[in-house]
Interface confidence: medium
């Protein structure tokens, strides 16, 4: 069953989720609810996981509600026993382990007329598994904040995660056992199998021929017998004969008839002839003695003297008789002449299958394993041998023995490892199965017990100077304060690197941001505006280049502006009649200075190599394997010694070429087996071994014997536009484009209007590379200054 | 912030008994699993015993049916019960946080036992 | 008796990168995952790398775990030092009933 108990509840201004009152109206003065409180009762809906919780569809695990059992705010963890506070939810089908839970406080309105109203709702998907143990949970948002505690058990004889586990002890016809804390049946002693109502027979009662029906016994089938019924019943009658299947009569040597009971060879059977005579068998139990002489008799029992020749064996004594002489034999000896060991084993004394040894006047019985004693009647103590390996003791059974397992262990002699892995890890964790217990490993971020819990990576608080900690799965982010950077807000950040401050002003540091000091001609953040004097002082126009203003900050009290007309790579030259002209820096031409003149007219790269305009210089792009200021020079493939095992190096254009000596293949004569191994082909070149030689099969863009050298095809035709220049790069290109323009292909007109050249509100017209200022009426010169 | 801090060290006679204790701040020991580790002087590391949140406790076959491990929820505290002590049990003893992976990502900083007549 | 090998002892000058292994069995570093500790002159061990690879918070970038079948490795580079320490790797060892066993550890010098 799911079992639900309210804790608490905190509804302090007693108002309903839609933010009306309980019981009515609010105090005009401090908005807060008048009049009663709320009458608190809880509703419950269970049913199937849903990552995404929905309120609506069936509670198909079960719905249920509680009394009212308080008001705005009660405490009920204290009060033990109460039911009024608890739902319970039976389930007859097996627990799925994880479920969705949605619990809502709601205000009775103990009016028929007037509905009940909700004052909080909560929901919870998770998973849970039966325990006594209560799990607590909280809803801590909205208007009320309530908290309740869950388990899940399971029915009494049920067990499992899912309680779908029977077992129920007993002792009867139908089975003995007990039931372990897993629901596993543990057999009373002496019983087996699933059910534990099969008894456990005697140790060594034959399978075949053996049964019972109670622990211990051994029952013989008709025609067996013996202790274990391991003997076979011969025909009755049978004297010198045995049996293999029952009733059976099968005779010794030298022994015949139905009954084995005629001896065909009475003269080895019995040796009756004395004192040397020969014995000859005349018929079944017939024979006849020929005497050596001086004796006589049907046996040669009769001689004159007879004890003059020690005839009696084994240290027996010899008297004369009136038919020879008679023996008096030491104990264990018979016979006439002593020479025959009385068989002490006939009868059988040894008890419970033992076998006799027959010794001079005595037996020795060799017992069977279970079994001790003169005569193996006495039970074997089977425990001194130690068989129990990890168990807590060995009790001694009557022919047999047991170990009782420590937690943890199993079979005869507790030998074996309980596997206690049954999918109690969580989150991908994997299970170490340990004796009486398993270790759960965590993957990073996890831990617990079941791994069930994600590792605050926060509680170690690593963010400095302030930083927010956010917990995230196996890692943590710290939000920085303004003013700090960095993985845990360590860096304080220097607002001056890299330097915003232009044109030669000095850039002061800030908690969070930064300060330039401007000089006299620079305005704004960065210094990066032209001060317009004339705004703020007079100034005279000296030429079309130049105007004075006055400062303080020279000798003469004058300071002389130039204008910029001409850019960064000229300067302005007053011409008659208001006009200018502009002296360029080497490498620039045209009416502003404007143009980089094209230092790669003259076609300087040599061996496919791609030339990049520069400053009054250029630089040349290599094409692969050509090196040097012009791409003169073939670079050495052969430097590094690529060829192994004796082979010789050829340098070719970004590329090299092994021969190989005795038997040895490849790109670099590394195999005995292949040409090809993942290096032999470039830039994602498919290698095939033909033999004596390697072949590769190169992607778009690329070719050369192993793929090494970039086709020009995607420069081809010129992709960049406004005379920008293709460098090849695989099987894409990248335009270098001239100055004034900019994009992937060179497409877009840089604005050289930026940042804002004309003064006084003169407006900027854009070219190519250029700019012209057309000046707001009574401005003039190139900047409208 | 985490903090351990080892006590109960101190010279001991063969045979003798003596408890460690370890006092946890920061975070919940009955929750974790709590370790201790020795270190013999001028040898490597030795892990000695592990508590789990659950109450399962494992030992070291060099300690086994010698020392106890066991912890006080209400103290915030694990301790080391140790009995019949001998030579080779002289060391720096360390209580540890083990983390399942397993990992100790907390250490005390280790109280020293000597074992000698 | 179950053996994780480190090699005694391992040098360097500033600035170089440095290499300490450990070697283990199917039963320790094959089959879990393995965890290195530095403990400077008279201190508590304290932790570098875990589950093979990751670094605790703190931990500078310069120290890097890996793993490969039954051995284990830790590379430090950008030598400093502060760097010089013992360094002990662990793991859980399965024949020892899930006891975490050390390794003996690898004294590194700072040239």
């Known amino acids: 069953q799911f079992e639900l108990e309210i804790l608490s509840m905190q509804n302090v201004n007693g108002e309903l989720q839609n933010g009306n009152c309980c019981g009515g109206a609010r105090n005009p003065g401090d908005r807060k609810c008048t009049r009663d409180e709320c009458d608190t009762y809880f509703k419950v809906c269970l049913k199937e996981y849903q990552s995404r919780v929905t309120a609506g569809g069936p509670c198909s695990f079960g719905s249920g509600s509680t009394p009212v059992i308080g008001g705005n705010t009660f405490n009920l963890k204290a009060s033990r026993g109460n039911d009024r506070n608890r739902i319970v939810l039976p389930f007859s089908f097996a627990w799925p382990r994880s479920y969705t839970l949605l619990v809502e406080a709601w205000d009775s309105s103990n009016d028929t007329v007037q509905p009940d109203s909700i004052i909080e709702k909560a929901s919870h998907s998770g998973m849970i598994n039966p325990s006594r143990q209560w799990q607590t949970l909280k809803q801590n948002t909205g208007v009320a904040h309530f908290e309740y505690q869950i388990r899940v058990t399971c029915d009494d004889y049920y067990y499992g995660f899912g309680c779908n586990k029977f077992c129920r002890p007993r002792d009867d016809f139908f089975g003995h056992y007990a039931c372990d804390q897993n629901g596993n049946k543990t057999c009373m002693e002496g019983w087996m199998g699933p059910e534990c109502n099969r008894a456990i027979c005697r140790q060594g009662c034959s399978p075949k021929h053996g049964s019972c029906k109670l622990p211990g016994d051994c029952r013989c089938q008709y025609g067996w017998q013996g202790l274990y019924c391991d003997k076979c019943i011969p025909h009755p009658g049978c004297v010198h004969g045995i049996c293999n299947e029952p009733w059976q009569c099968l005779c010794e040597t030298n022994w015949g008839g139905q009954l084995c009971d005629k001896d065909l060879n009475y003269c080895g059977t019995h040796q009756p002839c004395l004192n040397g005579g020969t014995c000859s068998n005349t018929g079944p139990d017939k024979y006849q003695c020929s005497c050596p002489e001086g004796y006589s008799g049907p046996n040669c029992e009769i001689a004159e003297h007879a004890c003059l020749s020690d005839p009696c064996h084994n240290r027996g004594s010899c008297k004369e008789t009136s038919l020879g002489f008679e023996c008096e034999c030491s104990p264990g000896w018979t016979g006439p002449t002593c020479s025959t060991n009385i068989d002490d084993c006939s009868p059988n004394n040894c008890s419970h299958g033992g076998t006799c040894q027959d010794l001079v006047n005595g037996f020795k019985c060799v017992c069977p394993p279970q079994w001790t004693g003169k005569t193996c009647q006495l039970d074997a103590n089977e425990c001194e041998a130690k068989p129990c390996v990890n168990a807590k003791s060995c009790k001694n059974l009557i022919a047999s023995y047991y170990c009782d397992c420590l937690p943890g262990w199993m079979g005869q002699n507790c030998d074996i490892n309980i596997n206690d892995c049954l999918g109690q890890c969580q989150n991908d964790a994997s299970c170490r199965d340990l004796v009486n217990g398993y270790r759960c490993i965590c993957p990073p971020g996890y831990a617990g017990d079941h791994c069930e819990r994600d590792i605050d990576e926060c509680a170690s608080n690593p963010c400095l100077n302030g930083g927010h900690c956010q917990n995230e799965i196996n890692r943590f982010q710290c939000l920085c304060p303004t003013g700090f950077s960095g993985n845990l807000c360590q860096l304080d950040i220097d607002y001056c690197e890299p330097n915003p401050c232009q044109n030669g002003a000095q850039c002061y540091n800030r908690a969070s941001d930064y300060f330039c000091k401007c000089p006299e001609d620079y305005e704004g953040k960065n210094c990066s505006h032209l001060k317009d004097h004339c705004r703020t002082t007079p100034c005279e126009v000296i030429d079309s280049c130049t105007v004075a203003m006055a400062s303080n900050d020279t000798p003469e009290g004058v300071r002389y502006i130039s204008s910029n007309v001409c850019g960064p790579h000229g300067k302005c030259k007053s011409q008659s009649g208001g006009k200018f002209t502009c002296d360029c820096n080497k490498g620039f031409t045209g009416t502003y200075c404007h143009e980089n003149i094209n230092d790669c007219e003259s076609n300087p790269c040599r061996n496919g190599g791609t030339c990049i305009d520069g400053v009054n210089s250029y630089k040349c792009i290599c094409s692969d394997g050509w090196e040097g200021a012009y791409c003169e020079t073939n670079i050495n493939d052969c430097s590094q010694n690529p060829c192994h095992n004796g082979g010789t190096c050829r340098d070719l254009v970004n590329d090299f070429y092994c021969d190989c000596k005795n038997g040895w293949k490849g790109k670099t004569c590394h195999s005995r087996d292949s040409q090809c191994d993942e290096a032999t082909c470039n830039n994602g070149g498919t290698c095939y071994d033909e033999g004596d030689a390697f072949k590769c099969m190169c992607p778009g863009g690329w070719e050369g014997t192993t793929c090494n050298i970039a086709r020009n095809s995607s420069c081809l035709p010129n992709p960049c536009h406004n005379g920008g220049t293709c460098v090849v790069n695989g099987e894409s290109f990248t335009c270098v484009c001239k100055e004034g323009w900019e994009g992937p292909i060179c497409a877009q007109n840089t604005n050289d209007c930026s940042p804002h050249p004309c003064y006084n509100s003169g407006t900027c017209v854009d070219g190519d590379n250029w700019y012209r200022c057309e000046c707001a009426p009574g401005f003039a010169g190139p900047d409208c200054r | 912030e985490v903090q351990l801090l080892e006590s109960g060290g101190g010279l001991i006679q063969p045979g003798g008994s003596l408890r460690l204790s370890c006092a946890a701040s920061?975070?919940?020991?009955?929750?974790?699993?709590m370790t201790w580790v020795r270190q013999a002087p001028g040898k490597g590391l030795e892990w000695v015993s592990v508590i789990y949140s659950g109450g399962n406790t494992f030992y070291a076959d060099s300690v086994k049916g010698r020392f106890t491990i066991s912890r006080d929820n209400a103290k915030n505290s694990l301790y080391l019960q140790m009995n019949s002590l001998r030579a080779e049990d002289t060391a720096v003893y360390y209580c540890?946080?083990?983390?399942?992976?397993?990992?100790?990502?907390?250490w005390g900083q280790g109280t020293l036992v000597t074992v000698s007549s | 008796q179950a053996v994780v090998t480190q090699p005694p002892s391992a040098s360097g000058t500033p600035g170089q990168r440095v290499t300490i292994s450990c070697s283990g069995s199917?039963?320790?570093?094959?089959?879990?995952?393995v965890s290195w500790y530095q403990q400077l002159p008279g201190t508590a061990p304290k932790l570098l790398i875990y589950?093979?690879?990751q670094r605790p918070s703190g931990v500078p970038d310069r120290f890097s775990g890996s793993k490969s079948g039954t051995s284990a490795s830790l590379a430090i580079s950008g030598l400093q030092s502060e760097d010089e320490a013992d360094y002990y790797c662990a793991a859980w060892d399965d024949s020892l009933n899930g006891d975490v066993i050390f390794g003996g550890g690898t004294k590194l010098t700072v040239l």
């Open positions: 540890a946080r083990e983390m399942s992976g397993p990992y100790f990502d907390y």
């Open positions: 920061g975070f919940t020991v009955s929750s974790n699993y």
């Open positions: 199917s039963s320790n570093i094959g089959s879990n995952p």
């Open positions: 589950s093979n690879n």
